[in-house]
């Protein structure tokens, strides 16, 4: 395939030479290239009052190549087009025009939007989100124990971000209140407050030992027994029951 491309041989004239420069197959002293070597394009360049033939490996910007049996020519792209494969297939439009299916348009057709970065008409892309994850364990202050009412969360990913005219992304995180069967925290699970209570209890006992006259009623009353906590929660729960017939869902929007 890389053999010569079957060009018809021109009849030699007295001023036609075959010892040509720069890709010419035949040339003359006055007109430059008259024909080109295979895979080269013949272009006429105006120099002052005369036109000189030159052979180029590719057509200049704004031109496209057409093959003929005896010559490859460069032809101008359409007026609104900067780069093209042919007059009907533009690949880059001039400033102020948008490329769509090889054509240059001053505005994009219905259902498409202009991308001002690529200067193309592109499909409107709507946001796509994944399915929700399962609800997280019911938690309060980072713990899954030592309480009755907490919150649980579920999340989803954005699979496709929207284009300028596309539908916005929905929330990617959702939180709701939840109720669990109350369970005591094991030693390892105790949070900061549990440790503080323990420390206060120890201090109280130390004070008892060192100064029997020190009154520790105030301190003692600040520590509720599990039964007291349970009763208090039961009362609060009755008050809230009317409100809490349906679990409320609170959407935390972290739209991308």
């Amino acid at each position: 395939q890389n053999a010569s491309r079957g060009r018809r041989q021109r009849r030699m004239h007295p001023n036609v030479s075959q010892g040509c420069q720069g890709g010419c197959a035949t040339c003359s002293d006055y007109n430059g290239c008259l024909s080109c070597k295979p895979r080269l394009f013949f272009v006429l360049e105006r120099i002052g009052m005369k036109q000189i033939g030159v052979c180029l490996s590719s057509c200049p910007s704004g031109y496209y190549g057409t093959r003929y049996p005896d010559i490859n020519k460069c032809t101008k792209c359409k007026v609104d087009c900067d780069t093209c494969f042919n007059k009907n297939f533009c690949t880059k439009c001039k400033s102020g025009f948008y490329l769509h299916l090889g054509k240059c348009l001053d505005s994009c057709p219905e259902g498409l939007e202009a991308n001002n970065h690529t200067m193309e008409c592109v499909s409107i892309v709507h946001c796509e989100a994944s399915e929700w994850s399962p609800w997280s364990p019911c938690m309060k202050k980072g713990k899954t124990c030592g309480f009755k009412r907490g919150t649980e969360t579920r999340v989803r990913d954005i699979l496709q971000h929207p284009s300028a005219k596309g539908n916005l992304c929905p929330p990617t995180s959702e939180t709701r209140t939840c109720i669990v069967q109350r369970k005591k925290c094991s030693k390892g699970e105790r949070g900061k407050k549990g440790r503080e209570r323990k420390r206060k209890k120890l201090n109280k006992e130390e004070r008892k030992e060192t100064s029997s006259s020190s009154d520790s009623k105030g301190l003692e009353s600040s520590i509720e027994t599990p039964d007291q906590q349970e009763n208090k929660e039961r009362q609060q729960q009755q008050k809230r029951r009317a409100r809490d017939k349906q679990q409320k869902s609170v959407s935390v929007s972290t739209v991308h």
Epitope: Q1, N2, R39, F41, S57, S58, Y64, G65, T66, R67, Y68, N72, T75, T83, F85, N86, K87, N88, F89, T91, K92, L101, G102
Partner: antibody, heavy 117, light 111 residues
Framework: QVQLVQSGAEVKKPGASVKVSCKAS????????IHWVRQAPGQGLEWIGY????????GYNQKFKNRVTMTRDTSTSTAYMELSRLRSEDTAVYYC??????????WGQGTTLTVSS | DIVLTQSPASLAVSLGQRATITCKAS??????????MNWYQQKPGQPPKLLIY???NLESGIPARFSGSGSGTDFTLTINPVEAEDVATYYC?????????FGAGTKLELK
Amino acid sequence: QVQLVQSGAEVKKPGASVKVSCKASGYTFTDYSIHWVRQAPGQGLEWIGYIYPSNGDSGYNQKFKNRVTMTRDTSTSTAYMELSRLRSEDTAVYYCATYFANNFDYWGQGTTLTVSS
Amino acid sequence: DIVLTQSPASLAVSLGQRATITCKASQSVDYDGDSYMNWYQQKPGQPPKLLIYAASNLESGIPARFSGSGSGTDFTLTINPVEAEDVATYYCQQSNEDPLTFGAGTKLELK
């Protein structure tokens, strides 16, 4: 002489991406656009898109627009075609070809892509 | 998109006989007097090979028994006389508009 040598066969899982290379020699790499065409088993030819090696500008068939990316490395005269979010229907032989004055005159030997779970 | 319809889908011809394959475009592939129609030959396990460009021009190195004709929407590839090495699938392809498209192919076999 002009030669286009493509990378070897690939086996991918659905949802994955593949990047096929096409190394050009025997001509000035930046002179002609490189196009990619695919052929599913026992099927016809389907144009995917093109890249101008001179400036990296590319254009794609609308069918592949959101999944394909074409790049090039002028220092090694190599063109690349990356296809993402693969599905079983993408199983095909992928060809690169030089585009000279509105026809594909030189072709790579083809790269077989199999997409299977 | 320009749809190219090739006929017949397959063709059995005796050695030395003429084979004719047609390609019909859903719209004209002509512009400024040029026809943007090409023909390719593909043998099993090989890439396509350019035979005819711009409807009727023979690619260099291709035997003269291959010829192309037509304009607008109707194009023909003729092989005369058919030789054993011509057993292959033949595709038409238009370069006039984005996206570039190919016909579905015509499989040539020997009778």
